[in-house]
């Protein structure tokens, strides 16, 4: 907590951001909270991006003020209007582009003071993998597929029974460029699979880590997958 006096003679207010990642082509959120004011008229929110001349977004006197907005963000930004009064200055960014990556500043003015915090925003592509038994193969084979990744990730297989085993010799991974020529489809095949075992296909780049699990028994197949964004830290 920083308590001081700015040029205006008002106190500093606490502003908190969380580093996050955007999935290109989808909507993203740049997270920012601040000490709330009791009235909306004095709240000003400005989002700025390092290296960009115009504003990313401005909200003042209870409404969006977009006359100074940079062209690259035109029609793509919005604050959560009903949440501003309770200290939420987070920005929704529509149709995330690769070029949206960078350092953003969330700058806040209220009747109680001013404050700002920076946010590192990474962009890329990440998706949930699905692991299936490949019945077309000659031996027991698992196929792990994830439709959209960027930058190119690493793929590692693991098994519950053979913990610590290296499956690189018995797996084959390929990356197929998608139609928009940025993201890639990830396909990894694991050979010589034994039943009554749980296998995990782990896909990771510097933005996200995703895991697809499959449990193969004689009577059933169980699947589970989850995705985790990396480097989400508050400042």
């Amino acid at each position: 907590l920083i308590i001081g006096f700015g040029i205006s003679g008002r106190h500093s207010i606490t502003v908190t951001t969380v580093a996050s990642a955007g999935n290109i082509g989808e909507d993203g959120i740049l997270s920012c909270t601040f000490e709330p004011d009791i009235k909306l008229s004095d709240i000003v929110i400005q989002w700025l991006k390092e290296g960009v001349l115009g504003l990313v977004h401005e909200f003042k006197e209870g409404k969006d003020e977009l006359s100074e907005q940079d062209e690259m963000f035109r029609g793509r930004t919005a604050v959560f209007a009903d949440q501003v009064i309770v200290g939420n200055a987070s920005l929704r960014l529509k149709n995330v582009q690769l070029t949206d990556a960078g350092t953003y500043k969330c700058y806040i003015i209220t009747s109680k003071g001013k404050g700002n915090a920076n946010l590192e925003y990474k962009t890329g592509a990440f998706s949930m993998p699905e692991v299936n038994v490949d019945y077309n193969a000659s031996s027991e084979t698992l196929r792990c597929e994830a439709p959209r990744w960027f930058p190119q990730p690493t793929v590692v297989w693991a098994s519950q029974v053979d913990q610590g085993a290296n499956f690189s010799e018995v797996s084959n991974t390929s990356f197929e460029l998608n139609s928009e020529n940025v993201t890639m489809k990830v396909v990894s095949v694991l050979y010589n699979v034994t039943i009554n075992n749980t296998y995990s296909c782990m896909i990771e780049n510097d933005i996200a880590k995703a895991t697809g699990d499959i449990k193969v028994t004689e009577s059933e197949i169980k699947r589970r997958s989850h995705l985790q964004l990396l480097n989400s830290k508050a400042s």
């Epitope: 000490e35 709330p36 004011d37 009791i38 008229s41 209870g62 009064i85 309770v86």
Partner: antibody, heavy 115, light 107 residues
């Protein structure tokens, strides 16, 4: 879930003071404004003022300056309102309400000023 | 101070009716208007914030609209449990102010 607990009623003598309490639970007490609202029997709602517990910052309705004093005890997540020099005009239900949207309300304390 | 005028002190309605309550601000308050419902002997309950945002758990028959100085609160199909007093409130500037209330009653 959010709860704001207020005593049901209090009877006070004219010319005296009263301290009303509002005990909060179910959210981070220090990070939301706490507002106080007056409602006379059969009447509408009047905002008295608000306090931001994290700093103790207060905002008052000019009409209630000198009449009401807002304080908090962050250790017990409790907001207080002192009303002084009470008259029959102060007989009303007093509500505490959380955040600038008045998202959650206490049940209210009925203050009766009577000799 | 910003004054909020609710033109009808009482409104008569029937179950299943669509009803709209208006609120006029004495100056521009952007979209900083909330609507509350108060039933007899109970504390007010937030229904709509920032003019049009339904609060968590509020049924979708309740809607709000407007910006600037003119605001409307609508119940698309009145239920018996909706009979109450409805208040508008502005949080654009201090002092925060409420409308005088509109009592919704059965015809």
């Amino acid at each position: 879930q959010v709860q704001l607990q207020q005593p049901g009623s209090v009877l006070v003598r004219p010319g005296t003071s009263v301290k009303l309490s509002c005990k909060a639970s179910g959210y981070t007490f220090t990070s939301s404004w706490m507002n106080w609202v007056k409602q006379r029997p059969g009447q509408g709602l009047e905002w008295i003022g608000g306090i931001y517990p994290n700093r103790g910052t207060t905002e008052y309705n000019e009409k209630f300056k000198g009449k009401a004093t807002l304080t908090v005890d962050t250790s017990s997540s409790t907001a207080f309102m002192d009303l002084n020099r009470l008259t029959s005009e102060d007989s009303a239900v007093y509500y505490c309400a959380r955040d600038s949207r008045f998202a959650d309300w206490g049940q209210g304390t009925l203050v009766t000023v009577s000799a | 101070d910003i004054m909020l005028t609710q033109s009808h002190k009482f409104m008569s309605t029937s179950v299943g009716d669509r009803v709209s309550i208006t609120c006029k601000a004495s100056q521009d308050v952007s979209a900083a208007v909330a609507w509350y419902q108060q039933k007899p002997g109970q504390s007010p309950k937030l229904l709509i914030s920032s003019a049009s945002y339904r609060y968590t758990g509020v049924p979708d028959r309740f809607t709000g609209s407007g910006s600037g100085t003119d605001f409307t609160f609508t119940i698309s199909s009145v239920q018996a449990e909706d009979l109450a007093v409805y208040y508008c409130q502005q949080h654009y500037n201090t002092p925060l102010t409420f409308g005088a209330g509109t009592k919704l009653e059965l015809k």
